[in-house]
């Protein structure tokens, strides 16, 4: 039996090693021998759990032998040298390479010493985010889409927004066997207030140093929302000319502005200039309801404003007058 004190010889290796699909990876494995200890190594062996036989052996006189010679290579072991480094390189990683491997040293006088290493096969996903252009529907619809393609394991997708919203995430197999494509939809009831706002898709994956953030600028198509500004309920005869503005928010942009009154065409004192209406000075009181009708690709909407020009001293008030 081995003499006392020989139990200190240990195999050092990480418990888990990550490798990328299609790339090569080194499974590190070393025999740690304390200063006062003596050991002699005659064979290095790698075996995979659940499989019969060993996948790689380095023999003191026969050298290296491999179950798949094109895919495996002892990194440091050499004939005629001390066998203390059993590190094994694997080329062209496949999904099925993921699993538990045993690295073993055949030593004298200690006997066999081994350690298990979990090989994790990763695939780095490609991430994209895009807006889902929507119209006002009155019910929740996908407004943004985030896709993480070909990840192993599947990427984690989360959404960050001040607008609320709910994610709807699904998975399908990726193009390469063992990979997964994750699609996440961000769902919200569309409104004009949401148009142009940003939401952020956050993609997390083992292969990333830090999460990837993808910003989506939301698009909601809606007909014009119209109001008229420029009137302060304080217009008097004899005051300067004034301007009313037809304020319209819409997506897409307005294609036309049309001014009129409830009685029909504009009176002579009102001159349309696109989104603006010039009100010229008048010499008698008026009480007219003006209409601004705005059109875009989705339809037309209008706003009404009743304007009164009252009698009163022009010097004390703003309003409508001849200069």
């Amino acid at each position: 039996w081995p003499p006392p004190g020989t139990g200190d010889v240990v195999v050092q290796a990480p418990t888990q090693v990550p490798g990328f699909l299609g790339d090569s990876v080194t499974l590190p494995c070393y025999l740690q021998v304390p200063n006062m200890e003596v050991t002699h190594v005659s064979q290095l062996t790698w075996a995979r759990h659940g499989e019969s036989g060993s996948m790689a052996v380095f023999h003191q006189t026969q050298g290296p032998s491999y179950s798949e010679s094109k895919r495996l290579e002892f990194v440091a072991a050499r004939l005629g040298a001390e066998l203390r480094n059993a590190s094994l390189r694997m080329f062209g990683l496949r999904v099925e390479d993921e699993g538990n491997y045993t690295c073993l040293f055949v030593t004298f006088p200690q006997g066999s010493r081994s350690v298990d290493i979990w090989l994790r096969v990763l695939a780095k996903p490609q991430n994209t985010a895009e807006v889902q252009k929507v119209q006002l529907t009155g019910e929740p619809v996908p407004m943004a889409r985030c896709v993480s393609t070909g990840g192993r394991p599947p990427a984690q997708i989360t959404w960050h927004s001040d607008l609320g919203g709910m994610p709807n995430t699904s998975q399908v197999p990726g193009f390469l066997s063992g990979t997964v494509t994750v699609t996440s939809l961000w769902i919200l009831v569309p409104s004009s207030q949401v148009d142009g706002k940003n939401v952020t898709c956050k993609v997390e994956h083992e292969s990333f140093e830090k999460p990837q953030l993808l910003t989506v600028n939301l698009t909601v198509y809606y007909p014009p929302e119209v109001s008229i500004s420029g009137y302060d309920n304080n217009w008097y005869l004899g005051q300067n000319e004034a301007t009313l503005t037809c304020d319209a928010r819409s997506n897409p942009e307005p294609t036309g502005y049309n001014w009129s009154t409830t009685m029909g065409p504009l009176p002579p004192f009102a001159v349309a200039q696109g989104a603006q209406l010039l009100i010229r000075p008048v010499d008698k009181p008026i009480n007219t309801t003006l209409i601004c009708n705005v059109t875009n690709a989705l339809g037309a909407r209008q706003a009404e404003l009743t304007v009164q020009v009252k009698e009163g001293p022009p010097s004390e008030h703003s309003g409508i007058s001849r200069n």
Partner: antibody, heavy 116, light 107 residues
Framework: EVQLVQSGSELKKPGASVKISCKTS????????MHWVRQPHGKGLEWIGG????????SYNQRFKGRVTLTVDKSTSTAYMELSSLRSEDTAVYYC?????????WGQGTLVTVSS | DIQMTQSPSAMSASVGDRVTITCKAS??????VAWYQQKPGQPPKALIY???YRYSGVPDRFSGSGSGTDFTLTISSLQAEDLAEYFC?????????FGQGTKLEIK
Amino acid sequence: EVQLVQSGSELKKPGASVKISCKTSGYTFTEYTMHWVRQPHGKGLEWIGGIHPNQGETSYNQRFKGRVTLTVDKSTSTAYMELSSLRSEDTAVYYCARWTGDFDYWGQGTLVTVSS
Amino acid sequence: DIQMTQSPSAMSASVGDRVTITCKASQNVGTNVAWYQQKPGQPPKALIYSASYRYSGVPDRFSGSGSGTDFTLTISSLQAEDLAEYFCQQYESYPYTFGQGTKLEIK
């Protein structure tokens, strides 16, 4: 070529000791552990123990309860096995074998007969 | 100690036959198993190491397989010169132990 040449046959009385030599050539003696295996006539193989020539580390099969001593002479690249308190059941062919985890080269064997 | 149980203990086969010898370990020995051929009046000769790897110079009709506790030595096409006794051996832990042997005769 690697060669392990053992000393000749021995006839011993019960209670006596025997020392067998194994002279090596064709490789660096200090780079390989030397082990000893015995085989009673018509029977299986039994591992006795091993020694590494460099620092003289040894490992013994407990079945031999301190009756076996393994030594080396690095100057002549020779390994020795001494077995004491011989009894009739120790009658066997004794082999030295170079260790590579398994045993890749063996001596020709030394017949030790223990008989009164 | 780890017991290595070999079967059969003896067998006869004709030239050209496929011959299989099995060895069962009493506990897991991984792939730390060797196979030896011993012809009458000669020392054992190493055939296979690490359960399945052939020593250089060993004809490729000899192959080994297995891991854990069950191991097999196969001679794919028996030749007259294969008349011998075959032993398995574990080197997973001390004391190293051998199977009791399989005597192979040619019909």
